[in-house]
C-alpha cells in the first residue's frame, strides 16, 4: 500500500523520494511563482497511506518581498493570462549585501485605462520612481539600474479592462561587475560566468528571429563604473528577409505577439541549385482579411503554390525549384490581436530528380526506409522512442508523382495513462476523461464488497517511458459473510458436524437413533446472506412403531449428500 502520486503544480514541479510510508514529496515553483501550501509532504502510515498535507499550488503572487535576490523573475498575478481588476501589488527586491540590481522588461502589457506600473529606486512607496507607465510610452530597452540594493515595484489595476500584465527579470551584480544580460527569443554565450570587466558576451537568436538594435557582441567596460559598452540586442520576427540556409524558420512579424495591420512582407528562401524546398506550415492562424501567398520561384511573378486566408491546420508544400517567395499581406482595416496569432513555417532543402524528397529525421524517433534510394514505391516507416507515440501516419510511400503519400508524422510525448478500466462490483470517479498526467481515478466498491488494493490511482510521469498509474486497479471482493450458529441435535438423534459455527454455504446432516424416524429435512444448508441463515428448520426424531422398527432398520441413518465447500468469496 502506498500514497497516491502527488499532483505536479502548474508552473512548478514535484520530486518524490518514495510513495511508501515515510517517503516524502518536495515541491518547488518556476521563477516568478510562489508556493502556496506545504513545501514538503510526508507519506503517513495507515490502512490506506496518505500525505500529511494537501498538495501546494504555485501562484504568481500579488506582491512580496524577495530578499537575497540574485537572478529571477516577478510576474503579475495570472501571468501569462490576464491579471484581475482592483489589484494593488507591491514587490520589494533586495540584492545581497554590497550588490545592486538590474531589471529587464520581459513583457509589459497594461490595459489602456487607469492600470499603472511604477518601479522605484529604493525600498518603499515613497522612493523616487525610475519608471512610471503613466509617464513613459516606450519601455527602456536597456532596462533599469538601482543605485542601491533595492527596487520597489508597484502594480495597480482599476475596475475595468485587463491585460497580460508584466514579467520583469532581475539580476543582482557585484561591485566591479556588469549585470547578467538577457535576450528574449534568443541566447548568449559569455567568456566568464560572473561578468567582471573585460567579459565579452555574444548573442544569437532562435530560428526565425533576427537580431535588431544593439550589437551581436558586447563587452563589460569601465572598471570605475562597470557597464556594457552596447545595448543588448533584441530578437524579433521581422517583416521580410532573404534566407540562404538549407533549413530554417519563417515567422509572422512579431511572433508570438500579434502582427501589425496593413503590413506587406516578402521573404525569399534560396537553397542549392539542384535542390528544391519543402515548406512545413506548422501554424497558420491569420485573419480572414489577411493573405499568405507562396510563389514557386524567386519573385512575385512565379507560379502560385498556394494562397491562404483565415486559420488552417498543419500542412506541407513542395517547390519545383530551388527558390520560394513568401508574401504576407495583413488587412489594413482590422487586426487579430490574440497571442500566438500568425504563422510558423519551417523549410527544408530536399533533393529534386527522379526520387521523392528526402524525409527529415523526426525528434524523439527514427525512420527506416525500405531501400536506400527514395524511388517510386519506396516505403519509409517512422517509429518513436519509448515514452513517445507516433502522431499521424507512421508509414509513408513514395508515389508516382514523386510526392509522399502522407504528411510527415511527429513523435509526441505520451502525456496520458491508458484507461485503467472498470472494476467489477464498483463505481469509479474520474478527474479527467483522457487520463493526462496528474489525473486521478477513484474506485468505490458497491455495498457488500470490500476494496482490496488502492482506492485512488494517480497518473504520473516517468523520466523514461510512458506515464504510469501509481498502482494497479484494485479488486472489490465479496465481504466475509457471517456464519450460521450451530443447531442443537434433535432429541434421540445426532448432527454432523458438531460445530458451534457453520460457514456460509456449509451443510449440516441429521440422523436419528435406532427406533426413531426423521421428520423434516435430513440436510440443511447455511444460506449466504446479510445475515446468513439456515435453509430449513431443524428436523425432529419421532418414535417408530415396533413393526416399523424391525422393518426399517436400514433407515436409522438418513442418507445425505457430501458436504459442499464454502462459497468462494472472490467471485
Amino acid at each position: 500500500l502506498s500514497c497516491h502520486f502527488p499532483r505536479r503544480p502548474a508552473y512548478g514541479d514535484v520530486t518524490v523520494t518514495s510513495l511508501h510510508p515515510g517517503g516524502s514529496a518536495r515541491f518547488h515553483c518556476a521563477t516568478g511563482y510562489q508556493l502556496k501550501g506545504a513545501r514538503h509532504l510526508t507519506c503517513l502510515n495507515a490502512t490506506q497511506p496518505f500525505w500529511d498535507s494537501k498538495e501546494p499550488v504555485c501562484i504568481a503572487a500579488c506582491g512580496g518581498v524577495i530578499r537575497n535576490a540574485t537572478t529571477g523573475r516577478i510576474v503579475s498575478p495570472g501571468f501569462p493570462g490576464n491579471y484581475s481588476n482592483n489589484l494593488t501589488c507591491h514587490w520589494l527586491l533586495e540584492a545581497p549585501e554590497g550588490q545592486r540590481l538590474h531589471l529587464h522588461f520581459e513583457k509589459v502589457s497594461l490595459a489602456e485605462d487607469d492600470d499603472r506600473l511604477i518601479i522605484r529606486n529604493g525600498d518603499n512607496v515613497e522612493a523616487p520612481p525610475v519608471y512610471d507607465s503613466y509617464e513613459v510610452e516606450y519601455l527602456p530597452i536597456e532596462g533599469l539600474l538601482s543605485s542601491g540594493k533595492h527596487f520597489f515595484v508597484e502594480l495597480s489595476t482599476d475596475s475595468s479592462g485587463a491585460a497580460a500584465g508584466m514579467a520583469l527579470r532581475y539580476e543582482a551584480f557585484q561591485q566591479g561587475h556588469c549585470y547578467e544580460p538577457f535576450v528574449k527569443y534568443g541566447n548568449f554565450s559569455s567568456s566568464t560566468p560572473t561578468y567582471p570587466v573585460g567579459t565579452t558576451v555574444e548573442f544569437s537568436c532562435d530560428p526565425g528571429y533576427t537580431l535588431e538594435q544593439g550589437s551581436i557582441i558586447i563587452e563589460c567596460v569601465d572598471p570605475h563604473d562597470p557597464q556594457w559598452n552596447e545595448t543588448e540586442p533584441a530578437c524579433r520576427a521581422v517583416c521580410s528577409g532573404e534566407i540562404t540556409d538549407s533549413a530554417g524558420v519563417v515567422l509572422s512579424p512579431n511572433w508570438p505577439e500579434p502582427y501589425g495591420r496593413g503590413q506587406d512582407c516578402i521573404w525569399g528562401v534560396h537553397v542549392e541549385e539542384d535542390k528544391r524546398i519543402m515548406l512545413d506550415i506548422r501554424v497558420l492562424r491569420i485573419g480572414p482579411g489577411d493573405v499568405l501567398t507562396f510563389y514557386d520561384g524567386d519573385d512575385l511573378t512565379a507560379r502560385v503554390l498556394g494562397q491562404y486566408s483565415g486559420p488552417r491546420s498543419h500542412f506541407k508544400l513542395f517547390t519545383s525549384m530551388a527558390d520560394v517567395t513568401i508574401q504576407f499581406q495583413s488587412d489594413p482595416g482590422t487586426s487579430v490581436l490574440g497571442y500566438q496569432q500568425g504563422f510558423v513555417i519551417h523549410f527544408f532543402e530536399v533533393p529534386r530528380n527522379d526520387t521523392c524528397p528526402e524525409l527529415p529525421e523526426i525528434p524523439n524517433g527514427w525512420k527506416s526506409p525500405s531501400q536506400p534510394e527514395l524511388v517510386h514505391g519506396t516505403v519509409v516507416t517512422y517509429q518513436c522512442y519509448p515514452g513517445y507515440q507516433v502522431v499521424g501516419s507512421s508509414v509513408l510511400m513514395c508515389q508516382w508523382d514523386l510526392t509522399w503519400s502522407e504528411d510527415l508524422p511527429s513523435c509526441q510525448r505520451v502525456t496520458s495513462c491508458h484507461d485503467p478500466g472498470d472494476v467489477e462490483h464498483s463505481r469509479r470517479l474520474i478527474s479527467s476523461p483522457k487520463f493526462p498526467v496528474g489525473a486521478t481515478v477513484q474506485y468505490i466498491c458497491d455495498q457488500g464488497f470490500v476494496l482490496m488494493g488502492s482506492s485512488i490511482l494517480t497518473c504520473h510521469d516517468r523520466q523514461a517511458g510512458s506515464p504510469k498509474w501509481s498502482d494497479r486497479a484494485p479488486k472489490c471482493l465479496l465481504e466475509q459473510l457471517k456464519p450460521c450458529h450451530g443447531l442443537s441435535a434433535p432429541e434421540n438423534g445426532a448432527r454432523s458436524p458438531e460445530k458451534q459455527l457453520h460457514p456460509a454455504g456449509a451443510t449440516i446432516h441429521f440422523s436419528c437413533a435406532p427406533g426413531y424416524v426423521l421428520k423434516g429435512q435430513a440436510s440443511i444448508k447455511c444460506v449466504p446472506g446479510h445475515p446468513s441463515h439456515w435453509s430449513d428448520p431443524p428436523p425432529i426424531c419421532r418414535a417408530a412403531s415396533l413393526d416399523g422398527f424391525y422393518n426399517s432398520r436400514s433407515l436409522d441413518v438418513a442418507k445425505a449428500p457430501a458436504a459442499s465447500s464454502t462459497l468462494d468469496a472472490a467471485h
Partner: antibody, heavy 120, light 106 residues
Framework: EVQLQQSGPEVMKPGASVKMSCKAS????????MHWVKQNQGKSLEWIGE????????GYNQKFKGKATLTVHKSSSTAYMELRSLTSEDSAVYYC?????????????WGQGTLVTVSA | QIVLTQSPAIMSASPGEKVTMTCSAS?????MHWYQQKSGTSPKRWIY???KLPSGVPARFSGSGSGTSYSLTISSMEAEDAATYYC?????????FGAGTKLELK
Amino acid sequence: EVQLQQSGPEVMKPGASVKMSCKASGYTFTDYNMHWVKQNQGKSLEWIGEINPNIGGTGYNQKFKGKATLTVHKSSSTAYMELRSLTSEDSAVYYCARTYSYYSYEFAYWGQGTLVTVSA
Amino acid sequence: QIVLTQSPAIMSASPGEKVTMTCSASSSVSYMHWYQQKSGTSPKRWIYDTSKLPSGVPARFSGSGSGTSYSLTISSMEAEDAATYYCQQWSSTPPTFGAGTKLELK
C-alpha cells in the same frame, strides 16, 4: 450540524442550460463525496452522479452522461450541477445529498431541492 | 441496473394497526435502505443497512429481509407515519430507488 443549502427554483426554455448550486456547511467539504438525485413529478428518485470535492473526480449514472456536469468550488464549499439541452423530461426537483459516513451507502443528508421547470 | 419493486403502491392503515410494506429486487442485494418523504419536503433516511434505525426514528419501525425480498414494518400505526416510503439499494452501481409506497391514515 450538517446542512446543504440549494439555490432557488428555475424556469427555463427548451434547449437552454441551467446551473444550480449546493452550499455545504457543518462539516469538512472535501471529506465527503457530493451526490445529486432527481425526483420527477411521478415522485420516483434517480441517482444522477457524484463528485469527490478533493480530487475533482466525477462518476455518473450512464443515463445522465452528457446531460449533467458536476463541479465544485472548494474554497466556498459549494457543489454545482449543470444540466444542458433541457427538455420537458428534465422538469423535476433536483437534490444534492451526502452519505452518513465515507463508507456508507445511504443518503443521510439532503438539500431542500431545486425545482427546475422547462417550458416553452 | 437493479430494479426495485415496492408493494403495495398505496395503502391505508388505522392508528394502532400493524403495517408491512415490501421491496422486491430484480437481483440479490446485500442491504436495503428506506427513506420517508412527506409532501413538499426532502426524503429522510429512515432505515439503513436493512434493519438499523437512525436516531430520531421511532422504535415502532423495523426492517428485515435478505436476497431479493425486504420489508419495512410499523408495529403500531400512528398519524405522523403517513408518508411515502422509498427503498434504495447500492449493492450494484448505479444505486436505484423503488417507486415508493404511499401510506395513508384511515
